[in-house]
């Protein structure tokens, strides 16, 4: 049987059940390389409390559909008196990066995971030439996820004192220049994730090969190498390589630019101080507030919730968007869709789509940007579920009793962007991280 998601085959992936202190290793095309789980384990459970290993999915006992992968085992389990077998179930959804498998829940018999990934899309529009896993768990099983830094179009400029060259990078995947035919970036060779531009020439100095690594709790490393044979004439016989070290800052701060810290014979060392390198619980919340010892900040957007069936309305030229954030009130137009953001076509109000659901909510504060994300909306033709990204700005003089109002700024591949100026986005900082 052919592997259902070949892009995911090259790596052993990790997921964590934080509540029970369990680490899962997943290899969807072969077997994980863990002796204690046996030679054919596709999903291996490592219970860190009891220091035991169990195979909870056998690579030989795999069954697949376009959106579901199941690995059975021969191990019996007792579920309400019936004799079942232990199994793992991975539900796949279309995403814009390779993504990460997320542990959902486990019963006595079934271990459930969900994975939003380009590999599950109906169309190839989000697929990279080359992409590697962009997250890692530290020794305390805390997740560090750089997926939000991945640029689907364009690149980051590395801060470098050399006026004659420009070094462009992407994170964990190659640089796509198709949206900007006019700039210097256009000359970058396909597949490159680190592109050096000198004058009118552009050179591939690194492609992603291995996934993100953790070197210390707050330092993550990504390495790019030039795959192509044939040396560049300005590299003194060496093969180019790029090492990017992502550093979690010691306290809350605005984002910084990736900086070139060393360069020798086409070996480029870059340091990037960014809160995205911090563990995810420091940056994100599933509620509409971020506060407490762990986050170093106090943010509470819950006053923006609308009661009594009213919604915020944002004009999107062809569409009207109805928003009801930080609550579970149904939007009338999107009845029974559990939508936090509802898209209604002006010319035909029967055309209604959920652009993100209220139980699929993430509040993120990172590098000075406060963002509320709603995902899991109605599917687009690519298979990608519509989502909405609301970028908040602090405005102490916002109208509507300080609440302000969301403004639609545009849509990119079924992701809808809004900005929202409100006094409730004014962040209060604590200093003890």
């Amino acid at each position: 049987q052919a592997a259902p998601f070949p892009e995911l085959c090259s790596y052993t992936w990790e997921a964590v059940d934080t509540k029970n202190n369990v680490l899962y290793k997943i290899n969807i095309c072969g077997s994980v390389d863990i002796v204690q789980c046996g030679p054919s384990s596709a999903v291996c459970e490592h219970d860190l409390k009891t220091r035991t290993y169990h195979s909870v999915g056998d690579s030989v006992l795999r069954s697949a559909t376009r959106s579901l992968l199941e690995f059975n085992t021969t191990v019996s389990c007792d579920q309400q008196g019936t004799n079942h077998r232990v199994q793992s179930s991975i539900a796949f959804l279309c995403g814009k990066t390779l993504g990460t498998p997320e542990f959902v829940t486990a019963t006595e018999c079934v271990h459930y995971f969900e994975w939003r990934t380009t590999a599950a899309c109906k169309k190839d529009i989000f697929k990279a030439n080359k992409e590697v896993p962009c997250y890692v768990f530290d020794e305390e099983l805390r997740k560090h996820d750089l997926n939000p830094l991945i640029k689907l179009s364009g690149a980051y400029l590395v801060d470098d004192s050399d006026p004659d060259t420009s070094l462009f990078i992407n994170v964990c995947r190659d640089i796509d220049t198709l949206r900007d035919p006019g700039s210097q970036l256009r000359a970058c060779p396909p597949g490159t994730a680190a592109c050096l531009v000198r004058g009118h020439q552009a050179f591939d100095v690194g492609q992603p090969r291995d996934g993100l690594k953790v070197v210390r709790k707050d330092r993550l490393v990504l390495s790019y190498v030039r795959e192509e044979a044939g040396k560049l004439d300005f590299c003194d016989g060496h093969s180019p390589a790029v090492t990017i070290t992502f550093v979690c800052p010691s306290e809350r701060r605005e984002g910084t630019i990736p900086k070139l810290t060393a360069k020798s014979n086409c070996r480029y060392e870059i340091e990037w101080i960014t809160e995205y390198a911090c563990h995810r619980d420091y940056l994100e919340s599933k509620t509409c507030s971020l506060s407490g010892e762990q986050q170093d900040v106090s943010i509470d957007l819950t006053p923006l919730a609308q009661s009594g069936g009213s919604s915020y309305i944002s004009d999107g030229k062809e569409y009207l968007f109805y928003l009801n954030v930080c609550g579970e009130t149904e939007i009338q137009f999107c009845n029974k869709k559990q939508a936090a953001v509802c898209q209604v076509k002006k010319s035909d109000t029967s055309q209604v789509k959920a652009a993100g659901r209220y139980h699929n909510q993430t509040l993120r504060y990172s590098d000075g940007d406060l963002t509320l994300i709603y995902f899991g909306g109605d599917e687009c033709s690519s298979g990608f579920q519509r989502m909405s990204v609301i970028n908040f700005e602090c405005n102490k003089t916002a109208g509507n009793d300080g609440k302000g109002t969301p403004v639609f700024t545009g849509e990119v591949d079924c992701t809808y962007f809004f900005t929202w100026d409100t006094e409730y986005a004014c962040v209060h900082h604590h200093h003890h991280h």
Epitope: K151, S153, G154, A155, Y156, L157, D159, S166, F168, T177, R179, D180, P181, G182, S183, Q184, L185, R186, E254, G255, I257, P258, G368, D369, N391, E393, T409, G410, E411, V412, F417, T419
Partner: nanobody
Framework: QVQLQESGGGLVQAGGSLRLSCEAS????????WGWFRQAPGKEREFVAA????????SYADSVKGRFTISRDNAKNTIYLQMNSLKPEDTAVYYC????????????????WGQGTQVTVSS
């Protein structure tokens, strides 16, 4: 590719103010970072100000800090440059530009450009 059209230039006395606008059409507003540049006769095109697409983060050339403000109205797909306390040395053609490169102020990293609008500051 995005198309850009500047307006708002003109002749103004030293110490006066102008507000430049740049309307974007074509490709979606949301994937770009935006910049204002200027070019005086016989000089290189130079960076003035920039704003990131994903937030309202801004950066300015030292020569205009405290006097110029870049902003945007996402609903109108328009970028603005509010210029106060103008000086004769601010005389130039002002260009609006869009880039898919984050953290850049280099004109060669901007792939889409407007036609420019003339600003003349008399003493």
């Amino acid at each position: 590719q995005v198309q850009l059209q500047e307006s708002g230039g003109g002749l103004v006395q030293a110490g006066g103010s102008l507000r430049l606008s740049c309307e974007a059409s074509g490709r979606t507003f949301n994937t770009y970072n935006w910049g204002w540049f200027r070019q005086a006769p016989g000089k290189e095109r130079e960076f003035v100000a920039a704003i990131r697409w994903s937030s309202s983060k801004t950066s300015y050339a030292d020569s205009v800090k405290g006097r110029f403000t870049i902003s945007r109205d996402n609903a109108k797909n328009t970028i603005y440059l509010q210029m106060n306390s103008l000086k004769p040395e601010d005389t130039a053609v002002y260009y609006c530009a869009a880039s898919i490169v984050d953290f850049t102020t280099n004109p060669s990293h901007f792939g889409s450009w407007g036609q420019g609008t003339q600003v003349t500051v008399s003493s």
